[in-house]
């Protein structure tokens, strides 16, 4: 056995789920209901965090780790530990001060999150494009003409989307 | 923190003291041995940890033993083939810091 | 197994003055601080004054001072008062390699004049 806090210092020997009580001669007691200590030798046990309205409960808080949460359906985390949740859009859109609101023309979003991204210019790379973007899935970028031997088969291009997405020349 | 009563104890003989706590729970602290002989200075015996782990002072570990009930609040030492050298006022205490009031033990024939 | 050596002893002093009493390890403490100081009377157990080298254990008068790292330690008590009079002990913590976790001095006797 080797020894990892001090024997003599009376509150280094805590261990993890109790706190050194200085109004009782820095004995270790436990923490008591809804608080933790997620290291030894705590003067203090930290208040569980509650999972409360659009949070939900992922894990429950214990006597030496803190609770957790997620969001309910319909929102997501943002921020470390899951400090916000953010209402869900549906694909193809992206949320602003105003609610959900359509990718614009040229973007697309392929999550319930985040905003919508440019679809991928294939030209940059010397390619076509292969299949149109949409406002939830980006381009697909396909081998350039020059790329196709001569005789080979060409793709058919495939029907227009609702909004068809194109490269710019 | 108390020690149980100590007493007269023949060489040869297996030495049973108790230490029992209240206010505190053994689960989450420490119970150190100590003992000192007449006219002499401090010396460890051995500790039983939070988890229940034991070290002990190489000239003790081959022949003492510290156990602990937590239901009961009580650690105990168990010392085998006692010596007049075993003579000593033994303390209980949680970590360093708060100590037992010590009891006598006389080893003679 | 780690040996821990105090001097003076014993060691007087007048009410009033300060006392110096050094602690030396035969190797470094763990931590370069496992250290901790004690004062005992006749007939009663030991009472923690020091512990961590420096740090004042609760209810302890400020006029003891704790100060050293690694093998060598001093405990100082300033403003001497006829109630200092005792037995003061250093107590190191050692490495489970080292053959003893914990080790004791022999003590130096403080007489107040």
């Known amino acids: 056995f080797e020894r990892t806090r001090s024997l003599q210092d009376p509150c280094s020997n805590c261990p993890a789920g109790t706190f050194c009580d200085n109004n009782r001669n820095q004995i270790c007691s436990p923490c008591p209901p809804n608080s933790f200590s997620s290291a030894g030798g705590q003067r203090t046990c930290d208040i569980c965090r509650q999972c409360k309205g659009v949070f939900r409960t992922r894990k429950e808080c214990s006597s030496t780790s803190n609770a957790e949460c997620d969001c309910t359906p319909g929102f997501h985390c943002l921020g470390a530990g899951c400090s916000m949740c953010e209402q869900d859009c549906k694909q193809g859109q992206e949320l602003t001060k105003k609610g959900c609101k359509d990718c614009c023309f040229g973007t697309f979003n392929d999550q319930k999150r985040g905003i919508c991204r440019p679809w991928t210019n294939c030209s940059l790379d010397g390619k076509s494009v292969l299949v149109n973007g949409t406002k939830e899935r980006d381009v697909v970028c396909g081998p350039s003409p020059a790329d196709l031997s001569p005789g080979a088969s060409s793709v058919t291009p495939p029907a227009p989307a609702r909004e068809p997405g194109h490269s710019p020349q | 923190v108390k020690e149980s009563e100590g007493g007269l104890f023949k060489p040869t003989d297996t030495l049973t003291l108790a230490c029992t706590v209240s206010g505190f729970s053994l689960s989450y602290n420490a119970i150190t041995w100590v003992r000192q002989a007449p006219g002499n200075g401090l010396e460890w015996i051995g500790v039983?940890?939070?988890?229940?782990?034991?070290v002990y002072a190489s000239w003790a570990k081959s022949r003492s033993t510290i156990t602990r009930n937590t239901n009961l609040n009580t650690v105990t030492l168990k010392m085998t083939s006692l010596t007049a050298a075993d003579t000593a006022t033994y303390f209980c205490a949680r970590n360093f810091n708060i100590w037992g009031p010590g009891t006598l033990v006389t080893v003679s024939s | 197994a780690a040996v821990l050596t105090q001097t003076p002893s014993p060691v007087s002093v007048t009410v009033g003055g300060t006392v110096t009493i050094n602690c030396q390890a035969s190797q470094s403490v763990d931590n370069n601080n496992y250290l901790a100081w004690f004062q005992q009377k006749p007939g009663q157990p030991p009472k923690q004054l020091i512990y961590s080298a420096s740090t004042l254990a609760s209810g302890v008068s400020s006029r003891f001072k704790g100060s050293g790292s690694g093998t060598q330690f001093t405990l100082t008590i300033s403003g001497v008062q006829c109630d200092d009079a005792a037995t003061y002990y250093c107590?190191?913590?050692?490495?489970?390699?080292?053959?003893?976790?914990?080790?004791f001095g022999g003590g130096t006797e403080v007489v107040v004049k």
């Open positions: 107590l190191g913590e050692f490495s489970a390699s080292s053959g003893d976790w914990n080790a």
């Open positions: 039983i940890n939070y988890d229940g782990t034991t």
